[in-house]
């Protein structure tokens, strides 16, 4: 019950973060004009990692996306590269995990291959949380960059002034939302992994023999080993000796013509 | 790179008129939106009025609603500035400014011209 339970409830954090990281990716306000110590302007930028856009004074707002791949900075590229990977696997996660859910039965699927494709999901999580985080991560380094470069730039004097980047731009809403988000996919990934733990099946028995005399009758008896698969709390192998009578486990005496000799 | 020269400035009684003028060379600054600020002796810098970059939007100070009017002619790659009913706090050193309005995943530039002194007696 507990495995089931972690389990959904990292596919729904997952799930929760992913649309997160795809609303972050899709969304225009990834810097945004710093008004802090500024001349009054009656425009006001915001860009996104797809478009520029302005909303001037009177409420008029206009984008305008960005139709060149070569003129771009390398490391806006870098941050694109990184959020559409952690989106792509956060996708097929997904995909893979509905599958793995313990509450959902497809054919005969056993609990070892669901409890392979939950780990797997798991790690698809872990990985594009960890990619939306450092997109996010990479593009605030870049505005902090930039802001402190703009800010030299603003206290300049008025003598032959020909200022560039004197607008600064500071953190927008995006980049919190991609923070969370990638922090959600990636606590969702490490539910999924622990879950993954109680899915895959707590004994593999192998059916064994114990020989020894009774009397002059010799006894054997099916299932005298058992072997775990080390999830569980019996992690040595034992041999049990019962004069031939009883096994460990009652629900292994088989009753069988091979019984006595 | 864009540089941008003022002209128009000069010496004008009160409640007289003047008009500025913005050229711009290096690029045409058909995209970039132009503001006209102004700086007075010991003061900070006061924005003054603004145009987009299609020659709408015009948006102005409280101080100069109703007397200043910008206006743009791309074509010329000028700006120009309209005061009518100057008052003496008028006088500043006026200085145009272009800001790109659409910058490619960075901050927009920023150009500014040396400015021209505007003075209002009374």
């Known amino acids: 019950m507990a495995v089931t339970a972690c389990q959904g409830l990292g596919f729904v954090v997952s799930l929760i973060g992913i649309a997160g990281i795809i609303a972050a990716t899709c969304m225009d306000q990834w810097s945004t004009q710093d008004l802090y110590n500024n001349p009054v302007t009656a425009v006001f930028n915001y860009q996104g990692l797809w478009r520029s856009c302005v909303r001037e004074s009177s409420g008029f707002t206009e984008c305008r996306g960005y139709f060149t791949l070569l003129g771009l900075p390398a490391m806006l590229q870098a941050v694109r590269a990184l959020m559409i990977v952690g989106i792509v696997l956060g996708a097929i996660g997904l995909l893979v995990s509905i599958f793995a859910l313990k509450c959902i039965r497809i054919g005969s699927m056993e609990d070892s291959a669901k409890a392979n494709m939950t780990l797997t999901s798991g790690i698809m999580f872990i990985v594009s949380g960890l990619c939306a985080i450092a997109g996010v991560s990479v593009f605030a380094n870049m505005l902090v960059t930039n802001f402190w470069m703009s800010t030299a730039n603003m206290y300049t004097g008025m003598g032959g002034m020909v200022q560039t980047v004197q607008t600064r731009y500071t953190f927008g809403a995006a980049l919190f939302v991609g923070w969370v988000a990638g922090g959600l996919t990636l606590i969702g990934g490490v539910m999924m992994c622990i879950a993954c733990r109680g899915l895959a099946p707590e004994e593999t028995n192998y059916k064994a023999v114990s020989y020894h005399a009774s009397g002059h009758s010799v006894a054997y008896k099916p299932g005298g080993f058992k072997a775990s698969t080390g999830f569980g709390s019996n992690t040595k192998n034992k041999k049990i000796y019962d004069g031939g009578a009883r096994t460990e486990d009652e629900v292994q005496s088989y009753p069988s013509k091979h019984d006595y000799v | 790179e864009v540089q941008l020269v003022e002209s128009g400035g000069g010496l004008v009684q009160a409640g007289g008129s003047l008009r500025l003028a913005c050229a711009a060379s290096?690029?045409?600054?058909?995209?970039?939106?132009t503001n006209w600020y102004r700086q007075a002796p010991g003061q900070q810098r006061e924005f003054v009025a603004f145009?987009?970059?299609?020659?709408?939007?015009?948006t102005y100070a409280d101080s100069v609603k109703d007397r200043f009017t910008i206006s743009r002619d791309n074509a010329a790659n000028t700006v120009y500035l309209q005061m009518n009913s100057l008052k003496p706090e008028d006088t500043a050193i006026y200085l145009c400014?272009?800001?790109?309005?659409?910058?490619?995943?960075?901050?927009?530039?920023?150009?500014w011209g040396q400015g021209t002194q505007v003075t209002v007696t009374s």
């Open positions: 290096g690029r045409a600054i058909g995209t970039y939106d």
């Open positions: 145009i987009n970059y299609r020659g709408g939007g015009a």
């Open positions: 400014n272009a800001h790109e309005r659409f910058p490619m995943g960075r901050p927009p530039y920023d150009y």
